[in-house]
Amino acid sequence: MRRERGRQGDSSSCERQVDRVNLKPCEQHIMQRIMGEQEQYDSYDIRSTRSSDQQQRCCDELNEMENTQRCMCEALQQIMENQCDRLQDRQMVQQFKRELMNLPQQCNFRAPQRCDLDVSGGRC
């Protein structure tokens, strides 16, 4: 279920844009980072893919949004929501949030000024 979003700008417009992009590379990139860099990711579908490759694919996808800058927070919130139930300890959730907030900078976008990554219902 999709939560209400849109601290900045037209939330319905951002929601449509976030829906249209493929956030899987971003999710995979962040999961790889919090699990620690290794020579090979045996449990990943593209075995030779390194975190940096996923990062580039992630940045490319985020760039597909018409208003990347304005809708960045909504995209980050959706990634958080998608992965929330996978994270079963408090430190890992904090680590995931930190990596998520670093994402715009890694992609050479401006970080959203205010972006609440706490998923509704207190799940993350």
């Epitope: 999710e27 699990m35 579908d45 994270l87 079963q88 300890d89 408090r90």
Partner: antibody, heavy 118, light 111 residues
Framework: QVQLVESGGLVVQPGGSLRLSCEAS????????MHWVRQSPQKGLEWVSL????????EYADSVKGRFTISRDNSKNSLYLQMNTLRADDSAFYFC???????????WGQGTLVTVSS | DVVMTQSPLSLPVTPGEPASISCRSS???????????LDWYLQKPGQSPQLLIY???KRASGVPDRFSGSGSGTDFTLKISRVEAEDVGVYYC????????FGPGTKVDIK
């Protein structure tokens, strides 16, 4: 090292209630999701319930939903399972289990035996 | 519900020889985040289960490197490169993609 010690297992009649406890040590208890898993010769290993580190979210197997309640007291490093309307097929060893952080079970207690019989 | 099956259900082994256990799920265990949610546990006689392999292929802390996990989608394998006497017990696979479901177990004993 991580230690999980279960208690409270007894012989109880069908329809009865029981409360299991698990005392945890050797790790920061209030950082981790905790689970109950049971094991019987009939059903093998069966996940029962989980509770997030702060108690904000609980989940149950369909077979125990509405009858069992998981809870925790982080100030006491303790996990609980309140079992009501017990049935014969609830008879099993009940293990207290720590989540490793990504939905795998990295530490198990020694188990406590629950027998539901008239 | 995701149903887990294992084969063989019983595996007599010779110390020093390799051994392999197969686990199959009724649906793919690959999440959108790229991780396969499949773990392996060993329950030695009279003991609680212990984690061997998590997320498809990652060896748990303290687990000897003779144990390895592989596979993708619905088919997974646990390999022991050289079986030792202490490896006897029941091996279980478990999926954690949707809630948690264990396989029926594979009993490994010495021939």
């Amino acid at each position: 090292q991580v230690q999980l010690v279960e208690s409270g297992g007894l012989v109880v009649q069908p329809g009865g209630s029981l409360r299991l406890s698990c005392e945890a040590s050797g790790f920061t208890f209030d950082d981790y999701t905790m689970h109950w898993v049971r094991q019987s010769p009939q059903k093998g290993l069966e996940w029962v319930s989980l509770i997030r580190w702060d108690g904000s979210r609980t989940e149950y197997a369909d077979s125990v939903k509405g009858r069992f309640t998981i809870s925790r007291d982080n100030s006491k490093n303790s996990l609980y399972l309140q079992m009501n309307t017990l049935r014969a097929d609830d008879s099993a060893f009940y293990f207290c289990v720590k989540d490793g952080g990504l939905r795998y079970f990295d530490s198990w207690g020694q188990g406590t035996l629950v027998t539901v019989s008239s | 519900d995701v149903v887990m099956t294992q084969s063989p259900l019983s595996l007599p082994v010779t110390p020093g020889e390799p051994a392999s256990i197969s686990c199959r799920s009724s649906q793919s265990l690959l999440h959108s985040n790229g991780i396969h949610y499949l773990d392996w546990y060993l329950q030695k006689p009279g003991q609680s289960p212990q984690l061997l392999i998590y997320l498809g292929s990652k060896r748990a802390s303290g687990v000897p490197d003779r144990f390895s996990g592989s596979g993708s989608g619905t088919d997974f394998t646990l390999k022991i490169s050289r079986v030792e006497a202490e490896d006897v017990g029941v091996y279980y696979c478990m999926q954690s993609l949707q809630t948690f479901t264990f396989g029926p177990g594979t009993k490994v004993d010495i021939k």
